[in-house]
């Protein structure tokens, strides 16, 4: 089992039902990571969230809501190029043991047809800790708006830690960021999934240290091919 999921700081509760594709990956009853519903059978998350078995929470912004769907999943497929050391290609597909029931609160995320440019305003969401290094886990889904940062500007911060398929987002001089428990969750820009929470500086919320995301637009072929292959 990998490190517990990563990382919302300086955010606010999401508007109810505004993120119907958002899921939580639970280990037993405990939050492990975030994720997104790609279709009735598949959840997309970060590769570093891998476990042997998952309980997937869908359909409610509140963890522990009895009206939520809870579906077990025992098969997951990491991107073959994932590195535990560098977190390059940090994405994974999780196959649900039974189909999710789509509704107004459970919807498929829109995968990107293009990569959004730097400066685009996006929303990152999750049930991860709202304080760091001391942890405070909310029961309600939290959201924060951040802007995409160019690879050139992000490399100035993270230098050799940054790889090609990584996407950076943040707000200058702000603490706004994802944090422990948010990993694998969505960064949504103009209605499409552009990023999955991957990593950032610990403690979370260091000003001018952006959050780092897996750039989903670079992986749509792998996502579709993998779902087809393991139908």
């Amino acid at each position: 089992e990998e490190a517990q999921g990563d990382k919302i700081i300086d955010g606010a509760p999401c508007a109810r039902g505004s993120h119907p594709w958002q899921v939580a990956l639970l280990s037993g009853n405990q939050l492990h990571c975030g994720g997104v519903l790609v279709n009735e059978r598949w959840v997309l998350t970060a590769a570093h969230c891998k476990m042997n078995e998952y309980t997937v929470h869908l359909g409610s912004d509140t963890l522990g809501d009895r009206r939520a769907q809870r579906i077990k999943a025992s098969k997951s497929f990491r991107h073959p190029g994932y590195s535990t050391q560098t977190h390059v290609n940090d994405l994974m597909l999780v196959k649900l043991n039974s189909q999710a029931r789509l509704s107004s609160m459970v919807k498929k995320v829109r995968l990107p047809s293009r990569c959004e440019p730097p400066g685009t305003t996006c929303t990152v969401s999750g049930w991860g800790t709202t304080t760091s290094p001391d942890v405070t886990f909310p029961s309600d889904l939290m959201c924060v708006d951040v802007k995409l940062i160019s690879p050139q500007d992000c490399t100035k911060v993270y230098k050799d830690l940054l790889e090609n398929s990584m996407l950076c987002a943040g707000i200058p001089d702000s603490k706004k960021n994802a944090c422990n428990g948010d990993s694998g969750g969505p960064l949504v820009c103009r209605g499409t999934l552009q990023g999955l929470v991957s990593w950032g500086t610990f403690p979370c919320g260091q000003p001018n240290d952006p959050g780092v995301y897996t750039q989903v637009c670079k992986f749509t072929k792998w996502i579709n091919d993998t779902m087809k292959k393991h139908r």
Partner: antibody
């Protein structure tokens, strides 16, 4: 290859302030994703984390020492410093400066200075 | 603070022996557990990070396992150059804390 070098007096009188500086070469102290730490080791004993500083200037201290510790950074000189006030003989130790990878996913000390022995005695 | 209990505090083994050191955390630290080797008069050196990942350049006879509260460090075949004190360290929460150390000697 990142290298760290501690400097400062090896002897400090009780009640005075211990001051050490760490000079970093082969890497920038203003790189994100890393913390710059002070760790000490009492003679023949284990390791104790004192505190850390980030490129942003944010600091985190061990609660057991917090009231006496100040860590600061000078990015222009690629240095960070430790001040420990009101020292007693119990502060006699080898003091290490160290770089840690400080990510939400990985956290570990990857580079250490060679350590400097500071003795508190009158 | 998270307490780290390491055992044994010292051990003596022959060259070629398998050596095992355990480390227990006072609360769940997921896999935020690192192992360091310290030789007399030297600074510690990172061997294993995230409980089981071998640091670049470290011989493969060193390994680590565990998650949650219980962790194990193993030297599969003890070599003379492995005489040192080994420390576990939790990195789940601040302050980072270390185990008391295990001194490894050759019989």
């Amino acid at each position: 290859q990142v290298q760290l070098q501690e400097s400062g007096p090896g002897l400090v009188k009780p009640s005075q302030t211990l001051s050490l500086t760490c000079t970093v070469s082969g890497g920038s102290i203003s790189s994100g994703g890393y913390s710059w730490n002070w760790i000490r080791q009492h003679p023949g004993k284990g390791l104790e984390w004192i505190g850390s500083i980030y490129r942003s200037g944010s600091t985190y201290y061990n609660p057991s020492l917090k009231s006496r510790v100040t860590i600061s950074v000078d990015t222009s000189k690629n240095q960070f410093s430790l001040k420990l006030s009101s020292v007693t003989a119990a502060d006699t130790a080898v003091y290490y400066c160290a770089r840690a990878k400080a990510l939400t996913t990985h956290r570990y000390v990857d580079y250490w200075g060679q350590g400097t022995l500071v003795t508190v005695s009158s | 603070d998270i307490q780290m209990t390491q055992s044994p505090s010292s051990l003596s083994a022959s060259v070629g022996d398998r050596v095992t050191i355990t480390c227990q955390a006072s609360q769940d630290i997921a896999n935020y557990l690192n192992w360091y080797q310290q030789k007399p008069g030297k600074a510690p050196k990172l061997l294993i990070y995230d409980a089981s990942n071998l640091e670049t350049g470290v011989p493969s006879r060193f390994s680590g396992s565990g998650s949650g509260t219980d962790f194990t460090f193993t030297i599969s075949s003890l070599q003379p150059e492995d005489i040192a004190t080994y420390y576990c360290q939790q990195a789940r929460d601040l302050p980072f804390t270390f185990g008391g150390g295990t001194k490894v000697e050759i019989k």
